[in-house]
Every structure is written in structure tokens, then in C-alpha cells.
């Protein structure tokens, strides 16, 4: 058992059939010695008496708000919540393996820039008594601070018969550098409690490895006098780090038919500026990737051709 | 470079940028391999790495890129010996067309540009033995090439700066 | 995109010698080492060796060594290999293939496969 | 060389079945291990490299694992068009090998 914040403690259990549980003793907080009885909840039914009550926490049932009084008068409360560990593998009940970039992945982070500010989201098909907590800093063994805002429900999708429901939240490194090489990563531990139930899930990363540009914007399309052919030019994103000479693009442009199946050629170009052929029904797409470092490319920003 | 000349800021940024992308193409993004999973705080902390003060930054360039251009070669000939050393000749044995390579070659011939014959800078000590086991040698050569790119990435910033405002 | 093309299929007299060709297309031929393999009827995949076209260093299996001569001609992106003395169990298919641009040894591209038979 | 000693030869099971491929080396390849799938008269595929990496376009009911010595193929849900033949493959090591194989059929 470990206190989560004041008056909240959680019970870690082995978690299968006829598991013998954990004992857990309850301290009333107060001077008091006599006459103090316990409570489970809102039952009124008396579970013990003395300034400590001995449990055998096994099930939900054996976790809740432990009360204890005197003369009618609360004087203390122990919240009791169960974190599950099945065959050695702690319970990931609450939220949704996204699968992506490989399995076990519940917390996905992106950075639009190398300023220390990431946004990390995780997804639930639960929609009530459930609360987050985050807390963030980098390295662990001797950890620099990281702040993290206030979870909020950002997204809410209907999945067949299912609601999903998006949480996110936006964290800042306290002192970034955003030139230097990263040595130690960033550690996010989101805490889940739904119910009774507690979950912990972890992140792990570089910002480096989770930058995601925003797409190019200000695409502009000039035809060419007595040519098929068009100039295109666009500008990096105004959520870029700068200056753009240290912190650069690369792009890759493409021209899409209308149809799917069309085959499209891909470019790749370091400038700002393209010329290209552009059918009348085509449109044309460009979109942007740290130019040193392999992560994710932004997503397409289009202009019709037309 | 030493004494306070300026490199040859094009050169640099053309051979920093093949550099990348060879570190790249020696080790592509592997979904399953999460490497910092193997107790990484430990293993790269005798790496170079560029850091806050050395000013590798904008504006610490502007001041004095004599600080970052040191730092920059350190590491350059330390991935260089690493390249070098039987953890990348030993077995999985790597084809004679990998990348790696030429990436060991881009390294000296980087670290060269940046210090012409007769200069010497004071060079960092060179890494302890490699393991004897495959995989424990697989497992070093993923993450000294997973660090380079990530040095590599931060000298060629460097050196796409210079070459764009420090020029003569 | 990288394709591999092989001669056609080679019925051959014991003794004799065979020269199987793989012209490759879709990539720079001098970047990339090109290996063969082989495959006896209803039998497993053999590794026999491979060459580097940009310095034509050919490295055999060891088993192969005096049985095959693996070469390259640069200008047109052409790999051969050559079995000398044929017997009836060199009677396989053959398959030239090129490996992961991360110089590691499996195999992303194969050629088409050329049946060579051994007989009298 | 690195003898790749691969078991079943033969295995017979049904659409849906979860079908489980071993290969054992002779001594250690750190996780240097590729499969690959040979349909009957086609040439070998690659399904996957670093013994568990899916090559690009590879449907994920294909799964590796193992290090070291042992290694295993998995396919969770066999489909019909997996009838096929079956290969590990070594490149930790000159020569590189082949297990000889594992012809899969569907009940």
C-alpha cells in the first residue's frame, strides 16, 4: 500500500481466483483514543472500533472511503483504491491500446517545434467517474522539471456501437534548449483512476523522435506563360522553430489526380518552391519533415490546381 | 579551424547532411526496437553529445563558433573509432555495401575539414572494449547509431547556420 | 522500382558449364551487392555467395568455392554466375537477390528464378 | 556454419487456426533472423527481419519472435492464401543459412 495524495492510498493486489489479498491497517487521524467506530462509504453499518481498523483488501468490495467517527462526527477519511496485477502485468483496463507505433502504445506525444512544448493525448471508452492526473519531467534518476496543464477531454468519436473519448495534455519543459543534442528523455506518467480502480501509464521519448511539423501554409500556385507547367511555392509554418537557416525543412510535393488509383510522383526539395504540371482537375500537395532528422512528416496542406 | 579561422561552412553542411542521411539508411526507424527500454540514461552517457553550453546555438555562434566547432569534431572522431571497432566487424555481420561504410568515411572526412593537418585539438578518450556476444554487439550498434543521428542532426543545424549567415 | 530479370531455363550435359545472368533495373547497380541462391527440387534455399559490383569483390560460400565464379559488368547493370564441372545435383533453381539497404543480409528483391538441369 | 533447424517439415491446419513455426540455430544470431513465404511455383517472400519486424505490406496476423537461439513464426488466424512454404534465414554470420523449411497446408 502507497499513499497517491493525502488520505488516498492505493492497494497494489495479485490479481486471480482465491487470491489471498493484502492486509492493510487504517489509522484514524485524530488525538482521540475512544469511542471511534468505522464506516465503508455511505453504508452505516459498523465495520470496526479503536483508533486502527485491520482489513483484508481481496476485491472492489473491500476498497472505497473509510470513515471514522466519533459521536456522529466524521473525524478522518482513507480512500482505498486497487491498482490490479494479473500473471505479473499490471491491469490496463481504463485506456486504449493505440497500437501505434507498435502495441502496448497508450499515451501518443507530439511536438510541433523543438521549444520543450509537447501535447500528449490517450484515448478511453469510459465516460464517467474517471479522472487523470499527469506529471512529466526529463530523465528520472535525476529529474528537470517539466509542467504539465490540466487534462481535457479534447475529442469525443463514435466507434460502431461505442463512444471513444480523446483526453490530452499540454506540457512545457521548464528550460529547454531547443539546439542541443537531447541526452536524456522525457518521462510522462499519466495516473487513470476510474472508480475504484487505479492505473499508471508511462511514456517514454525524445522530443526529437515526437516532432510533427504543422502543414506548409501560404500554398500559391502562378502559371507559366505559354507552358502546361505551374510555379508553386509555400512557406514554412508559422509554429516552426526559428531561425529557419538552423532549424530547417525538407518537403516532398506531389500533384493528385482526381482519381484515387492515379499514379502520383512524389518530389522531394529542400526549397520553398516548385514547378510542377497541374491538370485541371488535379490538386496539389506539399508537405514538410525536419530536414536532419527522420521524424513524422506533416500532414498534406492542398490547393486545387484549378 | 583552430586559432579562430572559419571552416569551410558549404562543405560542412553538404557532407554534414550526406552524413544524416546515411546515419538514416544505416539504421531506418524499427517499430519493435524501443531501445531506451535497455537502461539508456547508463549506455550513451559516454557518448558526446552537443549540450546547452556549448554553444552550438544561434546566437552562440554568432559569438564565438570556435566552442561548437570543437565539440562538434570531438564527437565526429569518437563515432568515427566506434565505426571503426569490431562492434561493427564483429557478427551480424554487415554486407560491404551497408552504409556504415561510407559513414565512417564521412565522419573522418568531416572531422578533417574541420581541422586541416598539423592542428590538434585535444580528442576525447576513446570507448572500452566491445562484448563478445551477437547480440549484446547488435544491441551497442543500434544505439550508437540511434545517438549519431541525433548528433549528427544537431551538427548539420550547425553547419546549414553558418554556411547561411557566417560565410564570408 | 528495383527489379531483377534472369536468364531462361539451361538444360546442360554433366561436365559442362553453365552461365546464368541477372540484369537489374530500378536502383544503382554499383550500390548494392547482388547474392545468389539455390533451390534443389523440393529441397531448401542455399546461400552460394555474392559480389559487390562497385569494387567486384565476389565472397562465396565456402561449400561453392571452385564450383562457382560470380562477376559483374558495370555497364549494363548485369550480375552472372557461372557453375563450372556440372553434375546431377547441381540440378536446382537459382535465384539471384538483393539485400536491405541497412548492408544486412535479407533479402527484399529476388529474381524471377532460372531452373538449370543437369543430364545426361 | 550456422546449422537452422526448422519444425515442423509439414503441418496441416485449418482456416482460422493460430499456427506456430520454430527455428532453432545452432549458436547465437543475436536477433539477425528473416522469414520468408514460398507459394508453390513463386519465388520466397520476405515476411519479416530482426526476427519480429514485419516487412513493409506484410498483413500483421504475421508475427516473430525470439532471440539468441530460438526463434518463432506465428501466424494468428491462418487464411487460405498462406498455403505456402516457409523459411528462417540467418545473416548473423558467413555462409548465411536457411532452415530447410516448413510446407504449410490448409485442412
Known amino acids: 500500500i502507497w499513499e497517491l495524495k493525502k488520505d488516498v492510498y492505493v492497494v497494489e493486489l495479485d490479481w486471480y481466483p482465491d487470491a489471498p489479498g493484502e492486509m492493510v491497517v487504517l489509522t484514524c487521524d485524530t488525538p482521540e483514543e475512544d469511542g471511534i467506530t468505522w464506516t465503508l462509504d455511505q453504508s452505516g453499518e459498523v465495520l470496526g472500533s479503536g483508533k486502527t481498523l485491520t482489513i483484508q483488501v481481496k476485491e472492489f468490495g473491500d476498497a472505497g472511503q473509510y470513515t471514522c467517527h466519533k459521536g456522529g462526527e466524521a473525524l478522518s477519511h482513507s480512500l482505498l483504491l486497487l491498482h490490479k496485477k494479473e500473471d505479473g502485468i499490471w491491469s490496463t483496463d481504463v485506456l486504449k491500446d493505440q497500437k501505434e507505433p507498435k502495441n502496448k502504445t497508450f499515451l501518443r506525444c507530439e511536438a510541433k517545434n523543438y521549444s520543450g512544448r509537447f501535447t500528449c493525448w490517450w484515448l478511453t471508452t469510459i465516460s464517467t467517474d474517471l479522472t487523470f492526473s499527469v506529471k512529466s519531467s526529463r530523465g528520472s534518476s535525476n529529474p528537470q522539471g517539466v509542467t504539465c496543464g490540466a487534462v481535457t477531454l479534447s475529442a469525443e468519436r463514435v466507434r460502431g456501437d461505442n463512444k471513444e473519448y480523446e483526453y490530452s495534455v499540454e506540457c512545457q519543459e521548464d528550460s529547454a534548449c531547443p539546439a542541443a543534442e537531447e541526452r536524456l528523455p522525457i518521462e510522462v506518467m499519466v495516473d487513470a483512476i476510474h472508480k475504484l480502480k487505479y492505473e499508471n501509464y508511462t511514456s517514454s521519448f525524445f522530443i526529437r523522435d515526437i516532432i510533427k511539423p504543422d502543414p506548409p501554409k501560404n500554398l500559391q500556385l502562378k502559371p507559366l506563360k505559354n507552358s502546361r507547367q505551374v510555379e508553386v511555392s509555400w512557406e514554412y509554418p508559422d509554429t516552426w522553430s526559428t531561425p529557419h537557416s538552423y532549424f530547417s525543412l525538407t518537403f516532398c510535393i506531389q500533384v493528385q489526380g482526381k482519381s484515387k488509383r492515379e499514379k502520383k510522383d512524389r518530389i522531394f526539395t529542400d526549397k520553398t518552391s516548385a514547378t510542377v504540371i497541374c491538370r485541371k482537375n488535379a490538386s496539389f500537395s506539399v508537405q514538410a519533415q525536419d530536414r536532419y532528422y527522420s521524424s513524422s512528416w506533416s500532414e498534406w496542406a492542398s490547393v486545387p490546381c484549378s | 579551424v583552430p586559432g579562430g579561422s572559419s571552416p569551410a561552412w558549404a562543405q560542412c553542411q553538404q557532407l554534414s547532411q550526406k552524413l544524416c542521411t546515411l546515419a538514416w539508411s544505416a539504421h531506418p526507424l524499427v517499430g519493435h526496437m524501443d531501445l531506451r527500454e535497455e537502461g539508456d540514461e547508463e549506455t550513451t552517457n559516454d557518448v558526446p553529445h552537443i549540450q546547452c553550453g556549448d554553444g552550438c546555438d544561434p546566437q552562440g555562434l554568432r559569438d564565438n563558433s570556435q566552442f561548437c566547432l570543437q565539440r562538434i569534431r570531438q564527437g565526429l572522431i569518437f563515432y568515427e573509432k566506434l565505426l571503426g571497432s569490431d562492434i561493427f566487424t564483429g557478427e551480424p555481420s554487415l554486407l560491404p555495401d551497408s552504409p556504415v561504410g561510407q559513414l565512417h568515411a564521412s565522419l573522418l572526412g568531416l572531422s578533417q575539414l574541420l581541422q586541416p593537418e598539423g592542428h590538434h585539438w585535444e580528442t576525447q578518450q576513446i570507448p572500452s572494449p566491445s562484448p563478445s556476444q551477437p547480440w549484446q554487439r547488435l544491441l551497442l550498434r543500434f544505439k550508437i547509431l540511434r545517438s549519431l543521428q541525433a548528433f549528427v542532426a544537431v551538427a548539420a543545424r550547425v553547419f546549414a547556420h553558418g554556411a547561411a549567415t557566417l560565410s564570408p | 522500382q528495383v527489379q531483377l530479370v534472369q536468364s531462361g531455363a539451361e538444360v546442360k550435359k554433366p561436365g559442362s558449364s553453365v552461365k546464368v545472368s541477372c540484369k537489374a533495373s530500378g536502383y544503382t547497380f554499383t550500390d548494392q551487392t547482388i547474392h545468389w541462391m539455390r533451390q534443389a527440387p523440393g529441397q531448401g534455399l542455399e546461400w552460394i555467395g555474392y559480389?559487390?559490383?562497385?569494387?567486384?569483390?565476389?565472397k562465396y560460400n565456402e561449400n561453392f568455392k571452385g564450383k562457382v565464379t560470380i562477376t559483374a559488368d558495370k555497364s549494363t547493370s548485369t550480375a552472372y554466375m557461372e557453375l563450372s564441372s556440372l553434375r546431377s545435383e547441381d540440378t536446382a533453381v537459382y535465384y539471384c537477390?538483393?539485400?536491405?539497404?541497412?548492408?544486412?543480409?535479407?533479402?527484399?528483391?529476388w529474381g524471377q528464378g532460372t531452373l538449370v538441369t543437369v543430364s545426361s | 556454419d550456422i546449422q537452422m533447424t526448422q519444425s515442423p517439415s509439414s503441418l496441416s491446419a485449418s482456416v482460422g487456426d493460430r499456427v506456430t513455426i520454430t527455428c532453432k540455430a545452432s549458436?547465437?544470431?543475436?536477433?539477425?533472423v528473416a522469414w520468408y513465404q514460398q507459394k508453390p511455383g513463386k519465388v520466397p517472400k520476405l515476411l519479416l527481419f530482426w526476427a519480429s519486424t514485419r516487412h513493409t505490406g506484410v498483413p500483421d496476423r504475421f508475427s516473430g519472435s525470439g532471440s539468441g537461439t530460438d526463434f518463432t513464426l506465428t501466424i494468428s488466424s491462418l487464411q487460405p492464401e498462406d498455403l505456402a512454404d516457409y523459411y528462417c534465414?540467418?545473416?548473423?554470420?558467413?555462409?548465411?543459412?536457411f532452415g530447410q523449411g516448413t510446407k504449410l497446408e490448409i485442412k
Open positions: 559480389i559487390y559490383p562497385r569494387d567486384d569483390s565476389p
Open positions: 534465414h540467418q545473416y548473423s554470420s558467413y555462409p548465411f543459412t
Open positions: 549458436r547465437d544470431v543475436a536477433i539477425a
Open positions: 537477390a538483393i539485400p536491405d539497404r541497412s548492408g544486412y543480409a535479407w533479402f527484399i528483391y
